[in-house]
């Protein structure tokens, strides 16, 4: 039950995280105009990974896409790549994890296969989350660098009296969405990996040894781990005597294909 809950929760958390990564990637507010030095502006600028926008005081918003590919900063390209890789890995991970869910039966899929798929999706989620966090962090670092550079020469004198106020940009909402979403995807991935351990019965090299207690015949398998004839197989150890010591396999009973309608 705990394994199913962990796996299910991991899936849901990762799903929310990946939705967040997609949302952050599509959002226009990766960087927003810093209004600290110019709170009276009637024109508000903000930028995303794909386009830059200007909102006028009338509410009119005009967005222009970055139609050049070669003319864009390498860092921006890198952030785009990281976010896209994160989305692709996350999407594949979600697809894999759907089939890996313990509560979903597909044909006669063995638990070992489900465990492998859970682990695969978990790793994918972890990498996806890391990609998103890295992408957002690279962009944030770029903003901080540019912010202080523009602060250094905030006012450039043009012909004595004339001043041109340089537009400074600060963290936009998308950065926070990206960090949170990346973190959730990462957590979801870790949960899937933990669930995988619970799903997969581990192979042991110990042979089953029969101990004869006074008057009672009990099959006893040493070792703290689940022991079975095959990795992930559904075969249960048969009890020789009901009142005897239970194996871990019996405590953790595997659902059969008849358990779910």
């Amino acid at each position: 039950m705990a394994v199913t809950a962990c796996q299910g929760l991991g899936f849901v958390v990762s799903l929310i995280g990946i939705a967040g990564i997609i949302a952050a990637t599509c959002m226009d507010q990766w960087s927003t105009q810093d209004l600290y030095n110019n709170p009276v502006t009637a024109v508000f600028n903000y930028q995303g990974l794909w386009r830059s926008c200007v909102r006028e005081s009338s509410g009119f918003t005009e967005c222009r896409g970055y139609f050049t590919l070669l003319g864009l900063p390498a860092m921006l390209q890198a952030v785009r790549a990281l976010m896209i890789v994160g989305i692709v890995l996350g999407a594949i991970g979600l697809l894999v994890s759907i089939f890996a869910l313990k509560c979903i039966r597909i044909g006669s899929m063995e638990d070992s296969a489900k465990a492998n798929m859970t682990l695969t999706s978990g790793i994918m989620f972890i990498v996806s989350g890391l990609c998103a966090i890295a992408g957002v962090s690279v962009f944030a670092n770029m903003l901080v660098t540019n912010f202080w550079m523009s602060t250094a020469n905030m006012y450039t004198g043009m012909g004595g009296m004339v001043q041109t106020v340089q537009t400074r940009y600060t963290f936009g909402a998308a950065l926070f969405v990206g960090w949170v979403a990346g973190g959730l995807t990462l957590i979801g991935g870790v949960m899937m990996c933990i669930a995988c351990r619970g799903l997969a019965p581990e192979e042991t090299n110990y042979k089953a040894v029969s101990y004869h207690a006074s008057g009672h015949s009990v099959a006893y398998k040493p070792g703290g781990f689940k022991a079975s004839t095959g990795f992930g197989s559904n075969t249960k150890n048969k009890k020789i005597y009901d009142g005897g010591a239970r194996t871990e396999d019996e405590v953790q009973s595997y659902p059969s294909k008849h358990d779910y309608v």
Epitope: Q33, N38, V40, T41, A42, V43, N45, Y46, Q47, S52, C53, V54, E56, S57, S58, G59, F60, E62, R64, M158, V162, Q163, T164, V165, Q166, T167
Partner: antibody, heavy 120, light 113 residues
Framework: EVQLVQSGAEVKKPGASVKVSCKAS????????MHWVRQAPGQGLEWIGY????????KYNEKFKGRVTLTRDKSTSTVYMELSSLRSEDTAVYYC?????????????WGQGTLVTVSS | DIVMTQSPDSLAVSLGERATINCKSS????????????LAWYQQKPGQPPKLLIY???TRESGVPDRFSGSGSGTDFTLTISSLQAEDVAVYYC?????????FGQGTKLEIK
């Protein structure tokens, strides 16, 4: 047709208050910001502030802050400009002007103006 | 506040001749985000409210004759009337639309020579 119709001329004594109205028609009232601009006799134009009829948001020129209040009545599509503690230098024609949506923050329609005379 | 300075204060031009009015701002009105200039030109005839002629420094408002044109960028702007007509006699104002408080130039009175 877009129309901004302002209230009639007012004569006030120094220290008094005046409330000028501007009734909008021919467009969706809450979709456009309304600015107020004044013009002293023979002088240039001076921006007072604006009100957003959609959310009642306002912005004022620091010069008038504390003395001017912009309000709106959605039911009658009317905006009001109240100026208190009147001084002789407040004698001017007061205009309401609609901020155009795609006019780069420029005012595309203006009221006919309301002359406010402050005299003892 | 952004200070708008117009020149000349008054201008007399013959009918059919070109009239040029200049406007200088104390700060750049060019927005880096969209590379647009936030400057407007208004025409005010005696006893009338101002009328929008040009916005965004160079875009003519609908219904404005094409003899009116605006140019310039950053801090220096120009309103040009290519062929002066009798009905163009008025006071012309430039306005900062970039930052609050919105500020106007002192006005240029255009007359017929």
């Amino acid at each position: 047709e877009v129309q901004l119709v302002q209230s009639g001329a007012e004569v006030k004594k120094p220290g008094a208050s005046v409330k000028v109205s501007c009734k909008a028609s021919g467009y969706t009232f809450t979709s456009y910001i309304m600015h107020w601009v004044r013009q002293a006799p023979g002088q240039g134009l001076e921006w007072i502030g604006y009100i957003n009829p959609y959310n009642d948001g306002t912005k004022y020129n620091e010069k008038f802050k504390g003395r001017v209040t912009l309000t709106r009545d959605k039911s009658t599509s009317t905006v009001y400009m109240e100026l208190s503690s009147l001084r002789s230098e407040d004698t001017a024609v007061y205009y309401c002007a609609r901020l155009g949506f795609t006019t780069r923050n420029a005012m595309d329609y203006w009221g006919q103006g309301t002359l406010v005379t402050v005299s003892s | 506040d952004i200070v708008m300075t117009q020149s000349p204060d008054s201008l007399a031009v013959s009918l059919g001749e070109r009239a040029t009015i200049n406007c200088k701002s104390s700060q750049s009105l060019l927005n880096s985000g969209n590379q647009k200039n936030y400057l407007a030109w208004y025409q005010q005839k005696p006893g009338q409210p101002p009328k929008l002629l040009i916005y965004g420094a160079s875009t003519r408002e609908s219904g404005v004759p094409d003899r009116f044109s605006g140019s310039g960028s950053g801090t220096d702007f120009t309103l040009t009337i290519s062929s002066l007509q009798a009905e163009d006699v008025a006071v012309y104002y430039c306005q900062n639309d970039h930052s609050y408080p919105f500020t106007f130039g002192q006005g240029t009175k255009l007359e017929i020579k």
